[in-house]
């Protein structure tokens, strides 16, 4: 069998809402993957499991099942959304994300994704992780790959 290539493209969009009373940030982050089947037979994308970390804390998880099949020598682009919550011991981020003296409220998130594919009863898992910048201050749609290269505000240490 030839390889099945998984390429994490980046954040497609991030939609933000707040709970003012709880000082909580809700971020719905949609990511894009390219999955390439280099084989001469079809493969099933059985599931995608993803999680998002902020400051080494898992803030969101998602799992998609029975997603699609990819034909021989074909590639499919798949979007998946991870709902995340920044709250409790990280509620200090609420003031940052809602600060009106800043235009762009970029935070660094660790995106982790595992794709499970099957073919002829054989199962294969491919994982990727990537740091991405996401604006927690407004709804943002990114050009693919753009969120890797954005500037993030560096607080004074």
């Amino acid at each position: 069998p030839r390889s099945i290539d998984v390429k994490y493209i980046g954040v497609k969009s991030a939609y933000v809402s707040y709970d003012v009373q709880k000082r909580t940030i809700y971020l719905n982050i949609t990511n894009t993957l390219n999955i390439t089947n280099n084989n001469y037979y079809s493969v099933e994308v059985e599931n995608i499991t993803a999680q998002v970390q902020f400051a080494k804390t898992v803030i969101g998880k998602a799992r998609l099942n029975n997603i699609t099949h990819i034909g021989p020598l074909d590639m499919k682009q798949i979007d998946y959304t991870v709902p995340t919550v920044i709250a409790e011991e990280m509620s200090y981020m609420y003031d940052f994300c809602t600060l009106i003296s800043i235009k762009v409220h970029n935070i660094v998130l660790m995106m982790q994704v595992t794709v499970t594919t099957t073919y002829f009863g054989h199962s294969e898992q491919i994982s990727q992780e990537r740091y991405q910048y996401v604006d927690c201050g407004r709804n943002t749609t990114y050009q693919l790959g753009q969120s890797e290269y954005l500037n993030v505000l560096q607080p004074q240490q």
């Epitope: 933000v16 809402s17 707040y18 003012v20 200090y92 981020m93 003031d95 940052f96 809602t98 600060l99 009106i100 003296s101 800043i102 235009k103 201050g137 407004r138 505000l153 607080p155 004074q156 240490q157």
Partner: antibody
Framework: EVQLQQSGAELMRPGASVKLSCTAS????????MYWVKQRPEQGLEWIGR????????EYAPKFQGKATMTADTSSNTAYLQLSSLTSEDTAVYYC???????????????WGQGTSVTVSS | DVLMTQIPLSLPVSLGDQASISCRSS???????????LEWYLKKPGQSPKLLID???NRFSGVPDRFSGSGSGTDFTLKISRVEAEDLGVYYC?????????FGGGTKLEIK
């Protein structure tokens, strides 16, 4: 240390112009909007406007449109307020301010300059 | 512009008393992100304004817990549970939701 340092007091003639400065230390002004506030003697606080130092885009309260001009120089980390056609009504203390992130925990700090006194007198 | 109206203009109190200052906006000051940027400042002569409360009720770091903010819509209140000598000065409400941002006219807290 995060702070805003404003230029010294000015005594000006009516009709003249004056340019006040506000120099930031401990943070980069291009990351923040910078604000200017006016307080006349025995009067309240008035919001003049805000500037985005990164691109120079400025927004003014209608009252100060044509009177005030905000600019910024990111290389010197300084914001400026120019007041034109001065009259006695412009006699006031002018403050620059912003709110910044001051540590790795993204905590915020309200930051004000010490104020610049402008006196317009013939 | 959003007009911010404060009541009263002057508030004479005895030390240890509770003080309450009202602020009313001419229109709702909910920002497009859902937050209400209603803030309270204390201004003392010869000093720069000091932020006490932001987003209606969020006490800023270092501000004593005798200060509390409340309200919604267009009506907001600042309460000082036990007035101390260092609390005297002029209090301003401020809205930072809609440009141009605007201050209230101020309330002078003074000794009775």
């Amino acid at each position: 240390e995060v702070q805003l340092q404003q230029s010294g007091a000015e005594l000006m003639r009516p009709g003249a112009s004056v340019k006040l400065s506000c120099t930031a230390s401990g943070f980069n002004i291009q990351d923040y909007y910078m604000y200017w506030v006016k307080q006349r003697p025995e009067q309240g606080l008035e919001w003049i406007g805000r500037i985005d130092p990164e691109d120079g885009d400025a927004e003014y309260a209608p009252k100060f449109q044509g009177k005030a001009t905000m600019t910024a120089d990111t290389s010197s980390n300084t914001a400026y307020l120019q007041l034109s056609s001065l009259t006695s009504e412009d006699t006031a203390v002018y403050y620059c301010s912003t709110r910044v992130i001051y540590d790795g925990y993204y905590r915020t700090m309200d930051c004000w300059g010490q104020g610049t006194s402008v006196t317009v007198s013939s | 512009d959003v007009l911010m109206t404060q009541i009263p203009l002057s508030l004479p109190v005895s030390l240890g008393d509770q003080a309450s200052i009202s602020c009313r906006s001419s229109q709702t000051i909910v920002h497009s992100n859902g937050n209400t940027y209603l803030e309270w400042y204390l201004k003392k002569p010869g000093q720069s304004p000091k932020l006490l409360i932001d987003k209606i009720s969020n006490r800023f770091s270092g501000v004593p817990d005798r200060f509390s903010g409340s309200g919604s819509g267009t009506d907001f209140t600042l309460k000082i549970s036990r007035v101390e000598a260092e609390d005297l000065g002029v209090y301003y409400c401020f809205q930072g939701s809609h440009v141009p941002y605007t201050f209230g006219g101020g309330t002078k807290l003074e000794i009775k």
